[in-house]
Interface confidence: medium
């Protein structure tokens, strides 16, 4: 998103995700913010506060057990691409008070809005390496016990970080800096030179393969595990229905109406009313896509405190009863003994 | 090289709405920067009235509240302005001119159109 | 909106005279990004105004260096080394620092 629908192909200082209201009259330098900037705003403070503090300690209680244990890999490198995420949190927030004017340069507005892309196509990609996991501990017990290994889910995990950054290559070419004025300042958005057939084109693709595809596969996938674990009358399929449902579900309701409003920038004209509308609710949208960097722990907490009765025990304890019990393939039935099986599909599938 | 040329009446009455052309020549007004009109008053004082930018947002001096549209046709590299509802403290010439992000300043003008508002 | 007041409204001068423009802000021009967005433009009679000097101090292309800009926040300075002919007509000073950008009513060069 963040289109700047601009070209200045001749002036050497053009170096920017928001313009301005270009549309109504400039009453003043217009020293407050928009209603959706400050709810921007107070989302990312929130998401950044949970986010860091809740996926670090995800990253701490995990690292430890991520050689013997596979769940704990997959959580390890979720809560990692969540992490990263939160890391540009300060820097977006900081431009967004400023009313989007970008001092932080070029090279920053290229990396730092696309590690929520980045994070968006890791998420989405771990959590359909977690469901095929999940699928073939359900449907193929003996071919797990037999290759299922902690080597095999790092190279697993290797890919999808891989395919991740090829997916987010487009949003950090097209990204750069312009400036503007009345009043001056420096912006940070995607440029596509007036190229609508290419802004479509990457909005479909990140619509198509970080949301509706994943959407497709993943309902699929989970309707298959959990109608045979229904069958096998598994002991803790309502826990782990809900785990799921939570889980994917908050992948796809955060990233909703980013998805939608960035497919509709792309078809609009620039100028049209319904466009510099959806602009002014850009930030929000973005804001409200980095829930799912801080939802992940709150998540695994009320799942741990839900199997465990009460917050007994400490968070690190209780995030590691959830994050690293192991999968076990019983002999007679298929289906998974730990206590968050699905709970690995998680992580917020961005 | 950049050119800017002004057209439209000379001559309008009260009440009635003021439209002029600004035709571009050896730049495309989709290329980027700020299209603006700019007005000069009896006594030199200078006014700025409002511009659209390369993707077609406007912005307008909010003195002019609601009077003010300024459109442009891509495909003749012309933008207009529109001022409605004029009164005889319209009469002035105006202008329209590039503000030039390299400058950051109104670099390029129009020579200007006079027009005057009276019954 | 930022009022630009021009001092003096008239000056007389002979050919090769050295000629000094104030300008004055009613706010500081110093924008947060380090940048003053203080401008000059001559209008001679009959004919649009053409800028002379942008951002305080740098000369648009063509323009003699006998022209030079100066100053900083809410004063400013235009400065013309020697006089000559075709620099005889309006002075402008404007800012696009605040919204809307605003002119001041110009400085009359004339020959005494």
């Known amino acids: 998103m963040d289109s700047f629908n601009y070209t200045t192909p001749d002036y050497g200082h053009y170096d920017d995700k928001d313009t301005l209201d270009l549309n109504t009259p400039v009453d003043k330098t217009s020293n407050t913010l928009r209603v959706p900037d400050i709810l921007a705003l107070v989302i990312f403070a929130v998401v950044f506060l949970v986010g860091v503090l809740g996926n670090a300690l995800v990253v701490w209680v995990t690292a430890f057990e991520a050689k013997r244990t596979i769940n704990a890999i997959w959580f390890l490198n979720l809560a990692v691409a969540d992490f990263l995420s939160c890391l540009a949190l300060p820097i977006l927030f900081t431009s967004i008070v400023q009313h989007h004017h970008w001092p932080f340069g070029g090279a920053a507005c290229s990396i730092l809005p696309s590690l929520i892309l980045l994070n968006m196509y890791a998420s989405i990609l771990l959590l359909a390496t977690i469901s095929a996991d999940r699928f073939l501990l359900v449907f193929k017990p003996i071919w797990c016990q037999n290759f299922r290994g902690a080597g095999l889910a790092w190279i697993a995990c290797a890919v999808a970080w891989g395919l991740a950054l090829l997916l987010t290559i487009p949003s950090f070419l097209y990204r750069v800096v312009r400036e503007e004025y009345f009043p001056p300042k420096v912006l940070c958005g995607v440029d596509y030179s007036h190229d609508k057939r290419r802004e479509r084109a990457v909005a479909i693709v990140r619509l198509v393969l970080g949301f509706l595809w994943p959407l497709l596969t993943l309902t699929i996938c989970y309707t298959f595990i959990l109608l045979r674990t229904w069958s096998r009358r598994a002991t803790r399929s309502t826990k782990t229905l809900k785990v799921v449902v939570a889980v994917v579900a908050s992948f796809f309701i955060f990233w909703l109406p980013y998805q939608v409003t960035g497919i509709m920038m792309s078809f609009l004209e620039p100028s049209s009313p319904t466009f510099l509308l959806l602009k002014k609710l850009d930030s929000l949208c973005v804001s409200f896509a980095y829930i799912n960097c801080c939802i992940n722990p709150i998540i695994y907490v009320v799942a741990g405190q839900g199997f465990q009765g009460r917050l007994r025990k400490s968070l690190p304890s209780l995030l590691r009863n959830v994050l690293t019990e192991e999968s076990v393939v019983r002999e007679s039935k298929s289906f998974t003994r730990s206590t968050v099986d699905t709970m690995a599909q998680k992580t917020q599938a961005v | 090289d950049i050119q800017l040329q002004e057209s439209g009446p000379g001559l309008v009455k009260p009440s009635q709405s003021l439209s002029l052309t600004c035709s571009v020549t050896?730049?495309?007004?989709?290329?980027?920067?700020?299209w603006n009109w700019i007005r000069q008053l009896p006594g030199n004082k200078m006014e700025w009235m409002g511009h659209?930018?390369?993707?077609?947002?406007?912005r307008y001096n909010p003195s002019l509240k609601n009077r003010i549209s300024i459109t442009r046709d891509t495909s003749k590299n012309q933008f207009f302005l529109k001022l409605n509802s004029v009164t005889t403290e319209d009469t002035a010439t105006y202008y329209c001119?590039?503000?030039?992000?390299?400058?950051?300043?109104?670099?390029?003008w129009g020579q200007g159109t006079l027009v005057t508002v009276s019954a | 909106d930022v009022v630009m007041t021009q001092t003096p409204l008239s000056l007389p001068v002979s050919l090769g005279d050295q000629a000094s423009i104030s300008c004055r802000s009613s706010?500081?021009?110093?924008?947060?990004?380090?940048?003053?967005?203080l401008h000059w433009y001559l209008q001679k009679p009959g004919q649009s105004p053409k800028l002379l000097i942008y951002?305080?101090?740098t000369r648009f292309s063509g323009v003699p260096d006998r022209f030079s800009g100066s100053g900083s926040g809410a004063d400013f300075t235009l400065q013309i080394s020697r006089v000559e002919a075709e620099d005889l007509g309006v002075y402008l000073c404007?800012?696009?620092?605040?919204?809307?950008?605003?002119f001041g009513a110009g400085t009359k060069l004339v020959l005494t």
């Open positions: 404007s800012q696009s620092t605040h919204v809307p950008p605003t």
């Open positions: 951002k305080v101090s």
């Open positions: 659209i930018s390369n993707d077609g947002s406007n």
């Open positions: 050896g730049y495309s007004i989709t290329s980027g920067h700020y």
């Open positions: 001119a590039l503000f030039y992000f390299a400058y950051a300043s109104f670099a390029y």
């Open positions: 706010q500081s021009l110093l924008h947060s990004n380090g940048n003053t967005y």
